[in-house]
Amino acid sequence: MAVTACQGLGFVVSLIGIAGIIAATCMDQWSTQDLYNNPVTAVFNYQGLWRSCVRESSGFTECRGYFTLLGLPAMLQAVRALMIVGIVLGAIGLLVSIFALKCIRIGSMEDSAKANMTLTSGIMFIVSGLCAIAGVSVFANMLVTNFWMSTANMYTGMGGMVQTVQTRYTFGAALFVGWVAGGLTLIGGVMMCIACRGLAPEETNYKAVSYHASGHSVAYKPGGFKASTGFGSNTKNKKIYDGGARTEDEVQSYPSKHDYV
């Protein structure tokens, strides 16, 4: 039961995480104008991975897409790539994990196959989460560097008369969404990998029990699980399962709906 719960929870956590990664990638507020000590601004700038926006205090908002590919900073391209890789891996991981769920029966799929699929999806979620965290962190680092550079050149005086106020940018909401979502996907992936160990049918190497009959001796080995899946052979505290009984499979649990904000 614990294995099913761990696998189910891992799936749900990863699902929320990947939804968050998608949301973060699409959000416009990766970097927002630093307002210093002034919370009210007449013109507020914010930028995403795909477009930059300006919101006036009049309420008018205008967004412009980055219609150039070659003209964009390499770091921004790298962040985009990391986030997309994260989404793609996560989506594939979700697809694989659906079929791997213990509570869902697909034909006569063996537990070893489900274990392998659970491990695969788990690894995919881990890599997906790491991609998202890396992408967000690279962007955050870029912001910090630019922030201090623009602080150093806060006012570029022209002949000491005219001043140009440089717009400084700070962390936007998307960065925090991305970090949390990446973390959740990572946690979900770890949970799937843990669940995989519980799902894995292990080869039982029980010591032979000798029964001495009159005239000759017969060595009898009780039947264990079918085949080892190669996840390690721990002979300590092995449980003997009835090969035919599948108590956890009898009760099907359906994943509940979640609202993503």
């Epitope: 700038n45 300006v54 009049s58 005219v162």
Partner: antibody
Framework: EVQLVQSGAEVKKPGASVKVSCKAS????????MHWVRQAPGQRLEWIGM????????NYNEKFKGKATLTLDKSASTAYMELSSLRSEDTAVYYC???????????WGQGTTVTVSS | DIVMTQSPDSLAVSLGERATINCKSS????????????LTWYQQKPGQPPKLLIY???TRESGVPDRFSGSGSGTDFTLTISSLQAEDVAVYYC?????????FGQGTKLEIK
């Protein structure tokens, strides 16, 4: 048709207070910031502050903090500006204006003349 | 605060002639996010409130005759009336619409020569 109708002229003694109203019609009152601007005789226009009719949030020019207080009555689609501790230099025409695209004022009230004299 | 300085203080132009009013700001009014200049021009006739002519330095407000045009970027801006009409006699103000507090120029009085 968008209209901003202000209250009539006021004559006040130094130290007194005055409350100027600005009734909006012809548009959704809660969708636009309402700004107040003053024009003293022979002087340039001066921005006093603004209030958002939906949230009630305000922002003032430092020069007018403590002098002007912006309030509103959403149900009556009316914005108010109260000026306290009046002095002769507060004698001016006070305008309410609606903020639009480009952070520009597209509609203005007709102006309220406040005269402060002893 | 951004200081807005207009020149000249007064201007006399013959009917049908071109009138040019300049406005200079102490800080750039160009917003890098959308490459728009947050400068507004108003016209004020005696006993009337100001009337919006141009916003974003060069975008004409609807209903404003096309003889009015705005230009400039950063800190230097110009309002041009291509062919002066009698009804254009007024005081013209430029306004910083980029940062609070909004500030106005001292005004330029336009008269007919």
């Amino acid at each position: 048709e968008v209209q901003l109708v202000q209250s009539g002229a006021e004559v006040k003694k130094p130290g007194a207070s005055v409350k100027v109203s600005c009734k909006a019609s012809g548009y959704t009152f809660t969708s636009y910031w309402m700004h107040w601007v003053r024009q003293a005789p022979g002087q340039r226009l001066e921005w006093i502050g603004m209030i958002h009719p939906n949230s009630g949030s305000t922002n003032y020019n430092e020069k007018f903090k403590g002098k002007a207080t912006l309030t509103l009555d959403k149900s009556a689609s009316t914005a108010y500006m109260e000026l306290s501790s009046l002095r002769s230099e507060d004698t001016a025409v006070y305008y309410c204006a609606r903020l639009k695209t480009g952070n520009s004022f597209d509609y203005w009230g007709q102006g309220t003349t406040v005269t402060v004299s002893s | 605060d951004i200081v807005m300085t207009q020149s000249p203080d007064s201007l006399a132009v013959s009917l049908g002639e071109r009138a040019t009013i300049n406005c200079k700001s102490s800080q750039s009014l160009l917003n890098s996010g959308n490459q728009k200049n947050y400068l507004t021009w108003y016209q004020q006739k005696p006993g009337q409130p100001p009337k919006l002519l141009i916003y974003w330095a060069s975008t004409r407000e609807s209903g404003v005759p096309d003889r009015f045009s705005g230009s400039g970027s950063g800190t230097d801006f110009t309002l041009t009336i291509s062919s002066l009409q009698a009804e254009d006699v007024a005081v013209y103000y430029c306004q910083n619409a980029y940062t609070y507090p909004f500030t106005f120029g001292q005004g330029t009085k336009l008269e007919i020569k």
